[in-house]
């Protein structure tokens, strides 16, 4: 009789342990769901506000034709500037035409005045060729005016209405670029 009671007690204890484990799993699952829900809500909120505004560019970005531009309010070296743009789903500015250059320099004059802004242009150390970040060559009219006398890597920046070059490790503002969202209307 005592053995039977002991066996039942052990079975009950085992069942209790299993229930505790299940409860722990459920709590963990619930927490995970809550976290996912938070992400989803934030994502939906962004999507809805974007859809509601139907704005082709995010807040604080400037639109010109098919592009959105972000003019930074902080200084950083060229490589960090590129990473900062990537976090926002963009790349450093790639100037395709004189019209785009004019728009950028005109906008900068209105916003901040005559400062230095990194763009996505760098000089290959071996060949000395200037290339945009996607590997394409700048059009002849969009080459940096002065050759930097630097033994280090050289990168391009915009100042006033000129493209210039400087040691990539100097600190400057920067400009990011992404595609404008097409209106679905």
């Amino acid at each position: 009789k005592l053995l039977q009671v002991s066996t039942i007690a052990m079975q009950q204890q085992e069942k209790l342990i299993q229930q505790e484990r299940a409860l722990l799993n459920f709590t963990e699952w619930k927490r995970s769901c809550a976290l996912q829900m938070k992400y989803c809500q934030a994502f939906m909120q962004n999507s809805l506000s974007s859809a509601h505004n139907s704005s082709p560019c995010p807040n604080n970005w400037i639109q010109n034709r098919e592009s959105c531009y972000y003019v930074s309010e902080i200084w950083s070296i060229w490589h960090t500037s590129q990473e900062n743009c990537l976090k926002e789903g963009s790349t450093l500015l790639q100037i395709e035409s004189k019209e785009e250059m004019d728009f950028i320099t005109g906008s900068l004059r209105k916003i901040k005045g005559s400062y230095d802004y990194w763009v996505g242009l760098s000089q290959d150390g071996h060949s000395g060729r200037w290339l945009w970040q996607d590997g394409s060559s700048p059009s002849p009219g969009l080459l940096p005016a002065e050759r930097s006398q630097s033994a280090n890597q050289v990168c391009g920046y915009v100042k006033s209405n000129s493209l210039l070059s400087s040691n990539c490790s100097t600190w400057k503002y920067f400009i990011c670029e992404k595609y404008a969202l097409r209106s679905s209307v």
Partner: nanobody, 115 residues
């Protein structure tokens, strides 16, 4: 959280090609761009190539014209096609997810190019 898993590394001869893959899982909608970094022994980790969700690309000067980054959105995977490999490309290659709230890294895959 976001998990990134690299594959495709290995030992090859100079001039050969390799294709690295980075599979992303988890809360990937927080990721705005994906990139490949590399770290050679005794050197700093450097950005090799990156691609945004819109398909805009960026490359390090040393790999322009040799490496190509691409993505397959259906598979949540980013690829790095490495052609004309040089001994200087020997390094551990890491996949990185760029997000406004933080960055996510993979464990890395070793690429060794022998001369």
């Amino acid at each position: 959280q976001v998990q990134l898993q690299e594959s495709g590394g290995g030992l090859v001869q100079a001039g050969a090609s390799l294709r690295l893959s980075c599979a992303a899982s988890g809360s990937i909608f927080s990721i705005n761009a994906m990139g490949w970094y590399r770290q050679a022994p005794g050197k700093q980790r450097e950005l090799v190539a990156a691609i945004t969700n819109q398909g805009r690309t960026t490359y390090a000067d040393s790999v322009k014209g040799r490496f190509t980054i691409s993505r397959d959105n259906a598979k949540n995977t980013v690829y790095l096609q490495m052609d004309s490999l040089e001994p200087e490309d020997t390094a551990i290659y890491y996949c990185k997810g760029f997000s406004p709230t933080g960055d996510y890294w993979g464990q890395g895959t070793q690429v060794t190019v022998s001369s």
